[in-house]
C-alpha cells in the first residue's frame, strides 16, 4: 500500500545464531585476515642509521646487484613494520626490511598480537627477499606470556631446531609442531611465499568439532615468526664481502594470519568492549571473551562448545521465580540423565528444594496459585497447644493434631470431645450417653466413580485411539489457574501429531478443563510435567486454546512415543484412519 516505509523492501537479516524457528544453532564470526592493519613488533628494521642494501637478480649465470639506501627518516626510502600488514597491492609492493646480514646465531623476530583468542587457519608470508633458509612460527595462547612452536622450516631440521625432518603426524602427536624443508629454496629471489596451514595433515581435522586437541592447537592470541638463518650464495666471506653482506637481509611484503575470532560457536561477530578490547558478541546465554562460560543463572547444564549438530546453548536454572542465583552440580546433572544440574540457591517466598519447587517446613502449598507465585506457600499456623507439631501437610495444610483436636490448624475440639485445661491433652472425651436418635446423614460429595473413570496413568496408545480423536499433541504444563467453573492451564505445545479443523500451533497456549473433571481426576494432570493429550475439538471459554474433558486421553509423556506418533501421523495422511 501507499503507507509502506522506505525500508519495507529490505528483508530483515536472518539471525546466524538461530534457525528459522528461533531455535539456537551454531554461529561463527567471519573469516578474516587477523593481521590486517595491526602493529607488528620487530626486532630489527633497516634505516636507523641509513644504510645501503643491495638487491640481487639473476640473468642466466650472471648475478646482478642493484644497491639502494634504506632510510627510516625518509618515507620514500623507509621499510617500516607497518608495511607487513598494510593493503597488499601486487602492483605496488611495500616491504618491511631487516638490517643487513643478521646471520645465525642472530635471529630476527616479528611478533603480532591479535588482541584476543583466534582460531587460526593459516599464517602466510610473502617475501621481497629470498625466503629464509631456516624459520620458525610460534603461537601464544596467553597474550605473549608463553610461546609454543607452531611450525619449523629448514633444510637442516635436526641441526637448527633439534627436530626430525618431516616427522609423520599421528593422532598421538597432532598437536605438535613439525619441521619441513618445503618452502626453503633460495629461489625465487623475490616474491616467494611461505604458507603454514594449521590443520593440514592433522588426522582429526575432518572431525574438528569433536577434537578438543585440535581446537586447542589452532587457538592463538599472538603469532611470532623467527627468521633463524639467511640463504646466501656463499660469497659473504670473500675479499669483497661487504657488497655481498649488504645483499643478505629479510624483507617481507605481506604477513597474513587467516582465521576467525574464537567464540566457540556461540557468536557471529566480535566487537570492541568499553575498554576497546576485542570480545565475542555472545549468544545462546553464554558469556566471557570467548563465550567460554554460561552467563549467570544459566547453569542448568554444563557449558559446551557449539557443534554443527548441537548449539549446546546454556540453559537457565528452573527456580520457579523464587531464586536469583544457582550453581551447577555435575553429579546431579549426570543422575538426571544429563538433563538438569542446576541447584537453586537461597530460595525465597518460603519455598525449598533444588528448584524451589515445594514449600519449606512450616508452610504448605496454596493450590489456587501456581508454584511460581510469590504467595504459593502459606504459613501452616498450627495451634501452639492443639497441634502436635509445627509442620503441616504440604498440599492440604492440615496440621498434625493431638488426640481429640480437629480443624486445619488444630484449633478446636473434635465431636465428642471437650476442652480441658491441660496443654498436653487440650481436648478430652465427653462421657457418652446411650444413643437415642438416628445418626444425621452427612451429604456425600458427588460420586466420581459414577461420573467418570479416573485414569490410572498406565494407558496404552494405539492407532485406534489416535484416529478417534480430533487432535494429538505433546504438551508441557507450565501453570494452572482457577477460572470460575474451569481450570485454565498454561501449556507449551511441544509437538503437534494431529489436528482437526482448528489449527493448533506450537508454543504457549491455554488448555481448559472443567473443575469437576479435575476434581475427579478425569483427566489427572499436574503442573511442570509433560503429557500426550488426545482430545476432541470443542469451543473453549476464551475462544482460543484447546479443551480437554473426561473423554480426553492425558498420559504422562514418554520420549519413545515420538516415533510411534509420527508413524500414526503418516498412516493418517495415507487415509488409514478411515479404515481403523
Amino acid at each position: 500500500g501507499p503507507g509502506l516505509s522506505m525500508f519495507a523492501g529490505q528483508a530483515a537479516q536472518p539471525d546466524p545464531c538461530s534457525d528459522e524457528n528461533g531455535h539456537p544453532r551454531r554461529c561463527i564470526p567471519d573469516f578474516v585476515n587477523a593481521a590486517f592493519g595491526k602493529d607488528v613488533r620487530v626486532s630489527s628494521t633497516c634505516g636507523r642509521p641509513p644504510a645501503r642494501y643491495c638487491v640481487v637478480s639473476e640473468r642466466g649465470e650472471e648475478r646482478l646487484r642493484s644497491c639502494h639506501l634504506c632510510n627510516a627518516s625518509d618515507p620514500k626510502k623507509a621499510h617500516p613494520p607497518a608495511f607487513l600488514t598494510d593493503l597488499n597491492n601486487p602492483h605496488n609492493l611495500t616491504c618491511w626490511q631487516s638490517e643487513n646480514y643478521l646471520q645465525f646465531p642472530h635471529n630476527v623476530t616479528l611478533t603480532l598480537s591479535l588482541g584476543k583468542k583466534f582460531e587460526v587457519t593459516y599464517v602466510s608470508l610473502q617475501f621481497c627477499s629470498p625466503r629464509p633458509e631456516s624459520m620458525a612460527i610460534y603461537k601464544s595462547m596467553d597474550y605473549g606470556r608463553t610461546w609454543v612452536p607452531f611450525q619449523f622450516y629448514s633444510t637442516q631440521c635436526r641441526k637448527m631446531y633439534n627436530r626430525p625432518h618431516r616427522a609423520p603426524i599421528t593422532k598421538q602427536n597432532e598437536q605438535e609442531a613439525v619441521c619441513t624443508d618445503s618452502h626453503t629454496d633460495m629461489r625465487p629471489l623475490s616474491g616467494g611465499l611461505i604458507a603454514f596451514s594449521t590443520l593440514d595433515g592433522r588426522p582429526s581435522a575432518h572431525d574438528f568439532d569433536n577434537s578438543p586437541v585440535l581446537q586447542d592447537w589452532v587457538t592463538a592470541t599472538d603469532i611470532r615468526v623467527a627468521f633463524s638463518r639467511l640463504h646466501t650464495f656463499g660469497d659473504e666471506n670473500e675479499d669483497d664481502s661487504e657488497l655481498a653482506r649488504d645483499s643478505y637481509f629479510y624483507a617481507v611484503s605481506d604477513l597474513q594470519v587467516g582465521g576467525r575470532c574464537k567464540c566457540n560457536g556461540h557468536a557471529a561477530r566480535c566487537v570492541r568492549d568499553r575498554d576497546d578490547s576485542l570480545v565475542c558478541d555472545c549468544r545462546h546465554n553464554t558469556a566471557g571473551p570467548e563465550c567460554d562460560r554460561c552467563k549467570p543463572f544459566h547453569y542448568d547444564r554444563p557449558w559446551q562448545r557449539a557443534t554443527a549438530r548441537e548449539a549446546n546453548e546454556c540453559v537457565a536454572c528452573n527456580c520457579n521465580l523464587h531464586a536469583r542465583r544457582c550453581r551447577f552440580n555435575m553429579e546431579l546433572y549426570k543422575l538426571s540423565g544429563r538433563k538438569s544440574g542446576g541447584v537453586c540457591l537461597n530460595c525465597r517466598h518460603n519455598t525449598a528444594g533444588r528448584h524451589c519447587h515445594y514449600c519449606k517446613e512450616g508452610y504448605y502449598r496454596d493450590m489456587g496459585k501456581p508454584i511460581t507465585h510469590r504467595k504459593a506457600c502459606k504459613a501452616c499456623d498450627c495451634h501452639p497447644v492443639g497441634a502436635a507439631g509445627k509442620t503441616c501437610n504440604q498440599t492440604t495444610g492440615q496440621c498434625p493434631c493431638k488426640d481429640g483436636v480437629t480443624g486445619i490448624t488444630c484449633n478446636r475440639c473434635a465431636k465428642g470431645y471437650q476442652q480441658s485445661r491441660s496443654p498436653i491433652a487440650p481436648c478430652i472425651k465427653i462421657p457418652v450417653a446411650p444413643p437415642t436418635t438416628a445418626a444425621s446423614s452427612v451429604e456425600e460429595p458427588e460420586d466420581c466413580d459414577s461420573y467418570c473413570k479416573a485414569s490410572k496413568g498406565k494407558l496404552k496408545i494405539n492407532m485406534k485411539k489416535y484416529c478417534k480423536k480430533d487432535y494429538a499433541v505433546q504438551i508441557h504444563i507450565l501453570k494452572a489457574d482457577k477460572a470460575g467453573d474451569w481450570w485454565k492451564f498454561t501449556v507449551n505445545i511441544i509437538s503437534v501429531y494431529k489436528q482437526g479443523t482448528s489449527r493448533i500451533r506450537r508454543g504457549d497456549q491455554s488448555l481448559w478443563i472443567r473443575s469437576r473433571d479435575i476434581a475427579c481426576k478425569c483427566p489427572k494432570i499436574k503442573p511442570l510435567k509433560k503429557y500426550l493429550l488426545l482430545g476432541n475439538a470443542e469451543d473453549s471459554p476464551d475462544q482460543s486454546g484447546i479443551v480437554a474433558d473426561k473423554s480426553s486421553l492425558v498420559i504422562q509423556w514418554r520420549d519413545t512415543w515420538a516415533r510411534r506418533l509420527r508413524k500414526f501421523q503418516q498412516r493418517e495422511k495415507k487415509g488409514k484412519c478411515k479404515k481403523a
Partner: antibody
Framework: QAYLQQSGAELVRPGASVKMSCKAS????????MHWVKQTPRQGLEWIGA????????SYNQKFKGKATLTVDKSSSTAYMQLSSLTSEDSAVYFC?????????WGQGTLVTVSA | SIVMTQTPKFLLVSAGDRVTITCKAS??????VAWYQQKPGQSPKLLIY???NRYTGVPDRFTGSGYGTDFTFTISTVQAEDLAVYFC?????????FGGGTKLEIK
C-alpha cells in the same frame, strides 16, 4: 578429612525390613550426594541410588526402586537406607559412599544377612 | 543401562610385572570412568578418576587411559601390597555401573 561411619551388621527374617545408617563427618554434609552400593560375591558391586542431602532429592537404580528408600537427617549429618520385603537375594554388604569426582570416601560397610 | 565389561577376571603375576586391565563400555561414556582397588575385608579405594587422573596419594605406578568406550588401567611394576580386586566404574549416565572386577594374585 571426610569420614563415613556405618551402623553394625544385621540379621533379619525374610519379609522384614531393615534400616541402616551412615554418619558423615569432616565435610559439609549438604553439599555432596550420598550414594549407596550393594556388594555380593555373585553380582559384584551394584549402585543402588543417591540422595542429595541439601534438599532430599533422590535418584534410584530402577532395579532397586521399591526395595530401597533413601533419607537423610541434616541435623545429625546422617544418611539412612531402608530395605523392605527382604529375601535371601538381599543378603549383602551395603556401602555408603560420598559423591563428587568418583567415590573418594566410603563407609566400612554394613553386612545384612537374611535368614529364617 | 550401560554395561562395563572388564577383562580379565583373574591375573596371576609376579612382583615387578606390568599389569594391564581393560574395561569396555556398551556405549560411549566420554572420560567418566573411575578405577577402584578393594583389598580383602576392606571398602573400595579410589585410584583413578576421569579415566586418567590419579587420585591424591595414589602411587604413580597406577595409571589409567581411554576415552569413549575403551579404557585401560595399568600397574607398571606390581608390588606385593597390590594384591586386591580392581573395579572400573562409569558415572556418565544413571544408573552408575561397575565392571565385574579383576582379582590380582601374586605368585
Amino acid at each position: 578429612q571426610a569420614y563415613l561411619q556405618q551402623s553394625g551388621a544385621e540379621l533379619v527374617r525374610p519379609g522384614a525390613s531393615v534400616k541402616m545408617s551412615c554418619k558423615a563427618s569432616g565435610y559439609t554434609f549438604t553439599s555432596y550426594n550420598m550414594h549407596w552400593v550393594k556388594q555380593t560375591p555373585r553380582q559384584g558391586l551394584e549402585w543402588i541410588g543417591a540422595i542429595y542431602p541439601g534438599n532430599g532429592d533422590t535418584s534410584y537404580n530402577q532395579k532397586f526402586k521399591g526395595k530401597a528408600t533413601l533419607t537423610v537427617d541434616k541435623s545429625s549429618s546422617t544418611a539412612y537406607m531402608q530395605l523392605s520385603s527382604l529375601t535371601s537375594e538381599d543378603s549383602a554388604v551395603y556401602f555408603c559412599a560420598r559423591g563428587g569426582t568418583g567415590f573418594a570416601y566410603w563407609g566400612q560397610g554394613t553386612l545384612v544377612t537374611v535368614s529364617a | 543401562s550401560i554395561v562395563m565389561t572388564q577383562t580379565p577376571k583373574f591375573l596371576l603375576v609376579s612382583a615387578g610385572d606390568r599389569v594391564t586391565i581393560t574395561c569396555k563400555a556398551s556405549q560411549s561414556v566420554s572420560n567418566d570412568v573411575a578405577w577402584y582397588q578393594q583389598k580383602p575385608g576392606q571398602s573400595p579405594k579410589l585410584l583413578i578418576y576421569y579415566a586418567s587422573n590419579r587420585y591424591t596419594g595414589v602411587p604413580d605406578r597406577f595409571t589409567g587411559s581411554g576415552y569413549g568406550t575403551d579404557f585401560t588401567f595399568t600397574i607398571s611394576t606390581v608390588q606385593a601390597e597390590d594384591l586386591a580386586v580392581y573395579f572400573c566404574q562409569q558415572d556418565y549416565s544413571s544408573p552408575w555401573t561397575f565392571g565385574g572386577g579383576t582379582k590380582l594374585e601374586i605368585k
